[in-house]
């Protein structure tokens, strides 16, 4: 079954093709399901999901997060500002998704699927955005050194970083989905 498609939908050839918004919605839900599977492995493997020491690792990370000023919440909603924030945030998450690639044993393919599906999602959203000039792309050199730094952490910090990336990415996508459903 293709990413974001239900087998029920595939079996119904007479159905209307998906609109751009429906395609984006399904793509995000597909990625979220993938994150859910990765989180299961992470939480089963270590006690990171219950840890109270998250702040220690969070200092090393600058994970994208929605805030009131981004225009994605019900109060102060602004479609254009919000769309820019969603795309910019997803681009910033890419380096962290790259970091996740060698962090899973039984869910290696799932981690790759999340990464590739996010790239596709960014393309979908860029087609939807009117103001592409406002979107800042992360610097590749900065990303490379960040990746090296993350990979050099001790085992405990790497486990915690994995947990925090998954949790933050899930939250960012959930916020994005709620916002996109207002557009």
């Amino acid at each position: 079954v293709p990413p974001g498609e239900d087998s029920k939908d595939v079996a119904a050839p007479h159905r209307q093709p998906l609109t751009s918004s429906e395609r984006i919605d399904k793509q995000i839900r597909y990625i979220l399901d993938g994150i859910s599977a990765l989180r299961k492995e992470t939480c089963n493997k270590s006690n990171m999901c219950e840890s109270s020491k998250e702040a220690l690792a969070e200092n090393n990370l600058n994970l994208p997060k929605m805030a009131e000023k981004d225009g994605c919440f019900q109060s102060g909603f602004n479609e254009e500002t919000c769309l820019v924030k969603i795309i910019t945030g997803l681009l910033e998450f890419e380096v962290y998704l790259e970091y996740l690639q060698n962090r899973f044993e039984s869910s290696e393919e799932q981690a790759r699927a999340v990464q590739m599906s996010t790239k596709v999602l960014i393309q979908f959203l860029q087609k939807k955005a009117k103001n592409l000039d406002a979107i800042t792309t992360p610097d590749p050199t900065t990303n490379a050194s960040l990746l090296t730094k993350l990979q050099a952490q001790n085992q405990w910090l790497q486990d915690m970083t994995t947990h925090l990336i998954l949790r933050s990415f899930k939250e960012f996508l959930q916020s994005s989905l709620r916002a996109l459903r207002q557009m």
Epitope: R29, D33, M66, Q74, K170, L173, S175, R178, Q182
Partner: antibody, heavy 117, light 108 residues
């Protein structure tokens, strides 16, 4: 578990704050909701507060109801109360094992608010 | 918003009851069902249209897609006498109520 408190008899126009307290888990990791039920009536959704700190309210609740959260409590602030606001107020926890789906898997017993002159 | 039918239904012990819920727009299977007994808070029965919540009997079955959803209770028991509510989890913006109006199930 969850427990609501703060429900009482108030006169119309009086503001009131209800508090929902969690035991055994931290609220910061969960989406939370307030729902009310007038005597003999159905469930009426008031609003959600999500883990990203955003709040969403039912159309009728906007401006008069406000939800805020700490790691152990969720508050519902209500203003300009009228007799129509008489109800049992429930707080409920959203589940996180599936990535997107606002289902409510744990409810408090509710607290009764009576608005009468 | 969510339209639930019927408002009340009477069913014989061992019988089958069907409750319908209609959304005003497609909710992509993000639908839950709750059971509420007098003096108690609601209890989650089914989520994501058809997944049974922990500890819920397999006599409860959820189905549907798009805007139309159904809860079926088979082999009805006395303990099933309650009010049942559907709830959409798809959208929390510009809605009056995420819950349906409720269906009272009376067991004869």
């Amino acid at each position: 578990s969850l427990e609501e408190s703060g429900g009482r008899l108030v006169t119309p126009g009086t503001p009131l704050t209800l508090t929902c307290t969690a035991s055994g888990f931290s609220l910061s990791s969960y989406d939370m909701s307030w729902v009310r039920q007038a005597p003999g009536k159905g469930l009426e959704w008031i609003g959600y507060i999500y883990t990203d700190t955003s709040t969403y309210y039912a159309n009728w609740a906007k401006g008069r109801f406000s939800i805020s959260k700490t790691s152990t409590t969720v508050d519902l602030k209500m203003t300009s109360l009228t007799a129509e606001d008489t109800a049992t107020y429930f707080c409920a926890k959203g589940s996180t094992d599936y990535a997107f789906d606002t289902r409510l898997d744990l409810w408090g017993p509710g607290t009764l608010v009576t608005v009468s002159s | 918003d969510m339209t639930q039918t019927p408002a009340s239904v009477e069913v014989a012990m061992g019988g089958t009851v069907t409750i319908k819920c209609q959304a005003s727009q497609s909710i992509s299977n993000e639908l839950s069902w709750y059971q509420q007994k007098p003096g108690q808070p609601p209890k989650l029965l089914i989520y994501r249209t058809s997944t049974l919540a922990s500890g819920v009997s397999s006599r409860f079955k959820g189905s549907g897609s798009g805007t139309e959803y159904t809860l079926t209770i088979s082999g009805v028991e006395c303990a099933d006498a309650a009010t049942y509510y559907c709830q959409q989890g798809y959208n929390s913006n510009d809605v009056d109520n995420v819950f349906g109006g409720g269906t009272e199930v009376v067991v004869k």
